[in-house]
């Protein structure tokens, strides 16, 4: 059966919408499930049927009950069922469990918390904010149209929010609260295909031949922590370690560095003692996470060891 | 290519049982609802289930109680149990796409090819 | 139920000419939403059905515009404009009102 949690406080507003969808057009009819008895359209009665919507104003705890929403439309009846709850309204500040709305996370960049559940209503800004029951001032709170917007989040912003607004209907006001969670986290992570910073594509790299010679490999490959993610050299095509040249060796270990908050690797690459035969191999720089693998392809070049500058 | 391809079609006996499938591809199969239209011989066409988007399912008389509708989304497929089967039920059933989202009707757009269905002793 | 009627049952045609079929509804196929829930359907011979017209009067994908589908409430029409030989096969009003009834079905072939 489709059914659709609902809850709210005694002397409190509720709205539910039917949880089957319909056009504005299309008929539907309101039940009390245990009863089978019809909800009333006419607005006098405290709880009445306004098309998808089912209204409470305000809600008392005996209403709490399954009801049955049947969506007139062409081919076939949709039926859903709501399933409403009314609470006793809590002496102190905690807001228990059953009354929260779903968590929401946010960040630095991100920290909208959104009233749940007020597009129901027929409200006018501005929204009043707490947490853990303390009425939100300061610069940093911006209520903005439906949402609350949290200036500069830190780890100590978490908790439970509250909105409070009022409902309007035919001139009488009838108040509403909602609370949910938020947590920080940090910037969610991401991932993309490899991007080489160095060395460039196709470099010719300058040694002097009976020196040693450094190229580094350094690739991005995201934000945040990579699962799948890895820089390393090949000697035409093979592996370092199957190239059997004791004189070239990768640097054992990737350093993981996070620039612009971007998750990046070098992989070193050392030739002691460099040799004419040196020059005649083809370096690559491969760069590999999950999307795939780039590659930069380096050659080295002899570096007269007098350079002489007029 | 948006596609339905019945089976499980075949021979049986009167008061036997038989089970359809549809392989639904090339489109989001959950957003839709799914029916079955028959066809006997040399007949016209007779809808005989529906299943909307929350496995709610819909019968004419002629089948209530004796059919069953399901759907199992992440298999892009539709059922159709026939249980206790006449040989008023011999036809050629079709796999039929439907209504879009509860309420954007485009009519039956996609049908598949059918499966035949033979009941007799 | 809402019933069909669709006539005529047989239709000859010849290549070129208009052609007209009709279909009535027992009870008013106009719903709140302002749509006809009517539908026209064509069956060739040794195929599925495959949807002309939906809503009474909106031309299906891939459709040419010979066909056109009008009225509302209880009496519909689906015209062809022009008759091609590939146009034979049995067409089907249906109403998605209430449930799904089809018509009987109007058999066109070429003269």
């Known amino acids: 059966k489709f059914s659709k949690q609902s809850w709210g406080l005694e002397n409190e507003a509720l709205i539910v919408r039917c949880p089957r969808q319909g056009k504005p057009s299309y008929t539907v009819d309101w039940y009390y499930s245990q009863t089978n008895k019809s909800i009333p359209t006419q607005e006098r009665n405290r709880v009445f049927a306004s098309g998808q919507l089912l209204k409470f104003l305000p809600a008392a705890v005996a209403d709490s009950g399954i009801y049955t929403c049947i969506v007139r439309s062409p081919t076939f009846n949709r039926t859903g069922y709501a399933n409403v709850t009314i609470y006793k309204k809590q002496s102190d500040c905690n807001v228990p469990d059953y009354l929260m709305y779903s968590t929401v996370s946010g960040s630095e960049k991100n920290s909208k918390i959104y009233c749940p559940t007020i597009d129901l209503y027929n409200w006018t800004a501005p929204l009043e904010w707490f947490k853990n029951c303390q009425a939100l001032q300061g610069s940093r709170y911006r209520a903005h149209k439906s949402f609350l917007v949290i200036d500069n989040v830190m780890t100590e912003d978490a908790g439970d929010y509250t909105c409070k607004f009022i409902h309007n209907e035919n001139g009488a006001n009838y108040s509403v609260t909602a609370t949910r969670s938020f947590t920080v986290k940090d910037e969610q992570g991401f991932s993309l295909f490899p991007v080489i910073g160095a060395p460039a594509q196709n470099e010719i790299k300058e040694v002097e031949i009976g020196k040693n010679a450094n190229l580094t490999c350094s690739a991005c490959f995201g934000k945040g922590t990579q699962f799948l993610a890895a820089v390393l050299w090949q000697l035409n095509g093979t592996k370092i370690t199957d190239f059997g040249e004791p004189r070239i060796q990768q640097e054992e270990g990737q350093n993981q560095s996070f620039s612009n908050g971007l998750a990046c690797l070098d992989m070193v690459l050392r030739i002691a003692d460099v040799k004419e035969e040196d020059l005649l191999l083809q370096y690559d720089c491969l760069a590999l996470n999950l999307h795939g693998l780039r590659r930069h392809t380096v050659r080295l070049s002899r570096k007269n060891p007098i350079d002489h500058h007029s | 290519e948006v596609q339905l391809v019945e089976s499980g079609g075949g021979w049986v006996q009167p008061g036997g049982s038989l089970r359809l499938s549809c392989a639904a591809s090339g489109f989001t199969f959950s957003s839709y609802d799914m029916y079955w239209v028959r066809q006997a011989t040399g007949k016209g066409l007779e809808w005989v289930s529906g299943i909307d988007t929350v496995g709610d399912t819909y019968y004419p008389d002629s089948v209530k109680g004796r059919f069953t509708i399901s759907r199992e989304n992440a298999k892009n497929s539709v059922y159709l149990q026939m249980n206790t089967l006449r040989a008023g039920d011999t036809a050629v059933y079709y796999c039929v796409r439907g209504i879009y989202g509860d309420f954007y009707y485009y009519g039956l757009d996609v049908w598949g090819h059918g499966t035949t269905v033979t009941v007799s002793s | 139920d809402i019933v069909m009627t669709q006539s005529p049952l047989s239709l000859p045609v010849t290549p070129g000419e208009p052609a007209s079929i009709s279909c009535r509804s027992s009870q008013s196929l106009l719903y709140s939403d302002g749509n006809n829930y009517l539908d026209w359907y064509l069956q060739k011979p040794g195929q599925s059905p495959h949807l002309l017209i939906y809503?009474?009067?909106n031309r299906a994908s891939g459709v040419p515009d010979r066909f056109s589908g009008s009225g509302s409430g209880t009496d519909f029409t689906l015209k062809i404009s022009r008759v091609e030989a590939d146009d034979v096969g049995v067409y089907y009003c249906?109403?998605?009102?209430?449930?799904?009834?089809f018509g009987g079905g109007t058999k066109v072939e070429i003269k």
């Open positions: 809503l009474g009067s």
């Open positions: 249906m109403q998605a009102l209430q449930t799904l009834t």
